[in-house]
Interface confidence: low
């Protein structure tokens, strides 16, 4: 049966329990979750994970008695772990796995649970001992019973059957929201010193939440929601509101890359590239998060939350829930995938969405527009050719429009004034009889990649200026530093004079403004993205690619980027794999990204690593990869021993033999060497990379990847006839780096 | 905007194969399942299957495993489908139709214009 | 396979009057706490055209005259007021299990 995060069965109990036999099978990746409860006003069972280990509270009467899993075994590995608690004449057993864990006299006191057993959570129950107990499972149990009773019969609704494929679902899967009252609930979202959330969305919902947090201070919140097809986020702090929206339609069934950024001096929301974000001179503040984190709908309290709110978000939109996906999700940069979530509702693995590169076809609607922001305008000629009446004043024959259009050229993340030449007017005004400051401009489309900034009072707001504005030079232009080598700006021009005048110019005609975008040359710069600190096992060689470092350059491809390694090139520590021994002391990003590069530790303290990257004209400054060895730690997981017949062959797998060791995101290479003479057979290992009818050939020594690969066993070669079954003790000893350890 | 377009009318002999092809743009062919329906004349429809294009992989009506085969050119963006051993029960106008890329609903919401098989000796 | 069967056959409605389609399926074809049930409208030699997705949501573009309802096994396209414009083929299909099946159409005439 499938738990969420907050569901429950609830199994009645007629007469006090005098002996217990309970036997559980659960999965969870979640190191919190309520597995069990037998509840009566002070009698109690409780059995629950806590930091991923098997905690047991018995209280009998005025006895309490606590039992639990040893902290080095973790149980909130995903993967099933049996848990079966016997309570008989006086002594309570606990053993996990088969193996016994603990085990202590308890009073010979029957268990008095009038209010029933609870599966997987407590439901609303609010006994005084529940208090600080673990959240809902959000996970499988496989198999529950006591006394030989199935507790997993009836299911509610909410518990589904079978093991949910989201539990299991790596962060690579995509969150899919099946609505209509999806909700995944994640650990809160902090945004003390700045806060990032980033997806890809697929959906047509128009309208939608997609994320929320709520604040500390009550009505404190973060709201990203889709509202009529667009992105929009509200911040509320107790100072204020601060409401944007993205003119980016996104509910048109395609993936697009949404990232919203926050931090104490503004807010950010971009999608597919086109950003949209407040002034520098925000309202936000630091918002203490409380609660989780919740994406692609609302609980009750979120809901509430909105619709007390002065937006007026109504009842209807924030009952609804996302129809659509969410991928390649992150939180202020680490990934997150339906593993992660604390709970979830009507929530399926996967949207059918390829990890595949972005291809051009993705973006084609948008290339026809080149210049245009992202919606696009209505195909005009612009202005529209004005036709003035006649008995005109003769400046005004042949006259079609007012001024004549030079593109403004900006640097990229530069400013460039708005100057005569610009909005050049086509006529002499003072024979029109026209003042500067009658001519008047308004805004009625911003630029994708910058803003015009007006220093008039109170024209910002307004968005307006005047003729007079532009050759005193009070308007500029200031670019956001993005790549785009075009823009535009939308300008309604008319004229507010009294006199006689083409009616066009007192309606307003319609100009673009074109800008174009000298680019600049952005350094690269190199990010960590899971922090400047690596561990590597001592004696060992570790893998460094993209996971480890990479390089950010906003107008470079990955191909125009070459890494060196700053330091003294002898002992250098970086190697290419196919070149053992040599040390790399320049590499290139496609041989980064393609994993050719390794770190091989030799001894003694690990060497940091100084880096740099250039694009061929700018270096990014040198970035350090702080290093740590680390002595190898080998544990035995397995050793189970074989069983087979006489003569016969049997494979030695992971379930028999397989070791665990201490290194971090490393795949070490784990030797185990034979260290005493077989008595009644040997030890094989087969050629050709295991080939379908390779060879066997006896081996002294073979690598836990051959485990892994079925290409080790034990073959019997005791032709002897015995009376008994014989036992061959095979000695082994594990060697990881330099460490060994002996006597397997 | 999304446009599927289809190949032309095709006239073939009992016993022989046809190709037809569902040009698509407008939109990322490669994340999105593209369906094929079968329309006899004066009849409903029928759901032949499916193909997602970035992997090749693909979905049949049972009753039409054996008879068509859907694959799809990612480099041209074009899906195509092939119906072998002809016979006059598969004279039809076969559609190509996207399906949407969401979790749900795998409806289908742009159509080819339709190719029209006609099997004749 | 799930099985959809449309009543009626064929239906002639004055302009301006309600139009009501059934469709009824062989099991249900709900999931998710959603109905995967749509309803598609074919006007001669064109393809078929979306109307409503889930049972009840209507497709961008699509008059507010037309409205889907129904969960489980039944389910009902309403037009209202029909227009001249509305004279086609009706199918329902689901998609809660492959294979994909359609109803087998209602042929709608106009008054």
């Known amino acids: 049966a499938s738990f969420f995060g907050e569901n429950h069965l609830e199994v009645p109990v007629a007469t006090a329990l005098t002996d217990i036999d309970l036997q559980l099978q659960f999965s969870t990746s979640q190191p919190e979750a309520l597995l069990l409860l037998a509840a009566g006003p002070a009698d109690h069972l409780l059995l629950q994970l806590y930091s991923g280990r098997l905690q047991v509270r018995l209280v009998l009467g005025q006895e309490e008695l606590r039992l639990q899993t040893p902290a080095e075994t973790l149980l909130s590995d995903s993967i099933p772990h049996t848990v079966v608690l016997t309570v008989v004449e006086g002594w309570a057993t606990l053993s996990v796995d088969g193996f016994l864990n603990a085990s202590s006299a308890v009073p010979g006191a029957p268990l008095e649970v009038p209010y029933g057993l609870f599966v997987g959570g407590t439901g609303t129950l609010g006994l005084p001992y529940l208090r600080g107990t673990s959240r809902p499972l959000r996970g499988c149990l496989h198999a529950a019973t006591l006394n030989g009773r199935s507790l997993l019969r009836p299911l509610t609704p909410d518990v589904h059957e079978g093991c949910a494929e989201e539990f299991s679902a790596s962060d690579d899967v995509a969150l899919g929201f099946s609505g209509p009252h999806s909700l995944a609930a994640f650990p809160a979202w902090g945004t003390q010193d700045e806060g990032t959330l980033e997806f890809t969305l697929t959906t047509q919902s128009r309208q939608a939440p997609l994320a929320f947090q709520a604040g500390g201070r009550r009505g404190d919140f973060i709201y990203v929601d889709i509202f009529e097809g667009h992105l929009r986020a509200v911040v509320e702090k107790g100072q204020g509101t601060v409401l944007l929206h993205n003119s980016v339609p996104v509910a048109d069934g395609q993936p697009h890359e949404v990232s919203v950024h926050i931090n104490a001096h503004r807010l950010e929301i971009s999608v597919d590239q086109y950003p949209t974000h407040t002034s520098n001179r925000g309202v936000l503040s630091y918002l203490e998060p409380r609660g989780s984190l919740l994406l692609g709908g609302l609980d009750a309290e979120a809901s509430r939350h909105l619709q007390e709110h002065r937006l007026g978000l109504t009842p209807e939109a924030t009952n609804a829930s996302l129809l659509g996906c969410m991928e390649d999700l992150s939180v202020n940069g680490q990934r997150r995938g339906l593993r992660e979530a604390l709970l979830t509702r009507n929530m399926a693995a996967g949207c059918r969405l390829e990890e595949e590169e972005y291809e051009d076809d993705a973006y084609g609607h948008y290339e026809a527009f080149s210049t245009l922001a992202p919606e696009a305008w209505p195909a005009m000629e612009l202005p529209e050719p004005c036709v003035p009446e006649p008995g005109l004043p003769p400046v005004f024959a042949n006259f079609t429009q007012l001024l004549t259009i030079s593109p403004l050229v900006v640097a990229e993340g530069g400013t460039a004034w708005l100057e005569w030449r610009h909005v050049q007017p086509t006529l002499d005004l003072m024979e029109a009889e026209l003042r500067k400051s009658q001519v008047l401009f308004s805004v009625t489309r911003g630029a994708r990649h910058g803003e015009l900034e007006l220093d008039i009072p109170g024209a910002q707001a307004r968005k307006m200026f005047t003729l007079l504005d532009v050759v005193n030079r009070k308007a500029r232009f200031i670019h956001d530093g993005s790549e785009d080598t075009s823009d535009q700006l939308v300008l309604e021009v008319s004229v507010t004079a009294r006199v006689p005048m083409p009616s066009c110019l007192r309606r307003g005609q319609t100009y673009l403004l074109p800008i174009q975008v000298n680019p600049v040359n952005d350094p690269p710069h190199i990010i960590f993205p899971h922090g400047s600190l690596m561990v590597i096992l001592e004696h060992t060689q570790k893998p460094l690619g993209p996971e480890v470092f990479q390089a950010y350059d906003p107008d470079s491809a990955c191909e125009g980027l070459t890494f060196q390694v700053l330091g003294t090139s002898s002992g250098l520590p970086v190697e290419r794999r196919d070149q053992p021994g040599e040390p790399a002391t320049e590499f290139s990003c496609r041989e980064l990204e393609a994993g050719s590069l390794v770190y091989v530790h030799r001894g003694g303290p690990a060497q940091d690593l100084t880096f740099r990257v250039s694009d061929g004209l700018q270096a990014s400054p040198p970035a350090t990869l702080k290093v740590v060895a680390i002595r190898p730690a080998i544990q035995i997981h397995r050793s189970t021993g074989l069983r087979l017949a006489q003569g016969s062959a049997m494979p030695i797998l992971p379930a028999n033999l397989s070791v665990e060791t201490n290194a971090v995101g490393q795949d070490v290479s784990v030797l185990f060497r034979v260290t005493g003479a077989l008595q009644f057979g040997e030890l094989q290992k087969q050629g050709a990379g295991g080939v379908e009818g390779a060879e066997w050939w006896a081996t002294q020594a073979f690598h836990q990847r051959d485990v892994e690969q079925g290409r080790v066993r034990y073959l019997s070669t005791d032709p002897q006839h015995h009376a008994y079954d014989t036992v061959e003790n095979l000695a082994l000893e594990v060697q990881v780096g330099q460490e060994i350890l002996s006597n397997l | 905007q999304v446009q599927l377009q289809q190949s032309g009318p095709e006239l073939v002999k009992p016993g022989a194969s046809v190709k037809i092809s569902c040009k698509a743009s407008?939109?990322?062919?490669?994340?999105?399942?593209m369906n094929w329906v079968k329309q006899r004349p004066g009849q409903g429809l029928e759901w032949i299957g499916r193909?997602?294009?970035?992997?090749?992989?693909?979905n049949y009506n049972g009753k039409f495993k054996g008879k068509a085969t859907l694959t799809a050119d990612k480099s041209s963006s074009t899906a195509y489908m092939q119906v072998s051993s002809l016979t006059s029960v598969d004279s039809a106008v076969y559609f190509c139709?996207?399906?949407?890329?969401?979790?749900?609903?795998?409806?289908?919401?742009?159509w080819g214009q339709g190719t029209s098989v006609t099997v004749s000796s | 396979n799930i099985v959809l069967t449309q009543s009626p056959a064929s239906l002639a409605v004055s302009l301006g009057q309600r139009a009501t389609i059934s469709c009824r399926a062989s099991e249900s074809v709900d999931s998710y706490g959603n109905s995967f049930m749509h309803w598609y409208q074919q006007k001669p030699g064109q393809p078929p055209k979306l109307l409503i997705y889930?049972?009840?949501n209507l497709e961008s573009g699509v008059p507010a005259r037309f409205s889907g309802s129904g969960s489980r096994t039944d389910f009902t396209l309403t037009i209202d007021p029909v227009e001249a414009d509305d004279a086609a083929t009706y199918y329902c299909q689901q998609n809660n299990e492959d294979p994909l099946t359609f109803g087998s159409g209602t042929k709608l005439e106009i008054k």
């Open positions: 139709a996207r399906g949407n890329t969401v979790v749900v609903p795998y409806t289908m919401d742009y």
């Open positions: 193909i997602y294009p970035g992997d090749g992989d693909t």
């Open positions: 889930l049972a009840s």
């Open positions: 407008g939109y990322a062919f490669s994340r999105s399942w």
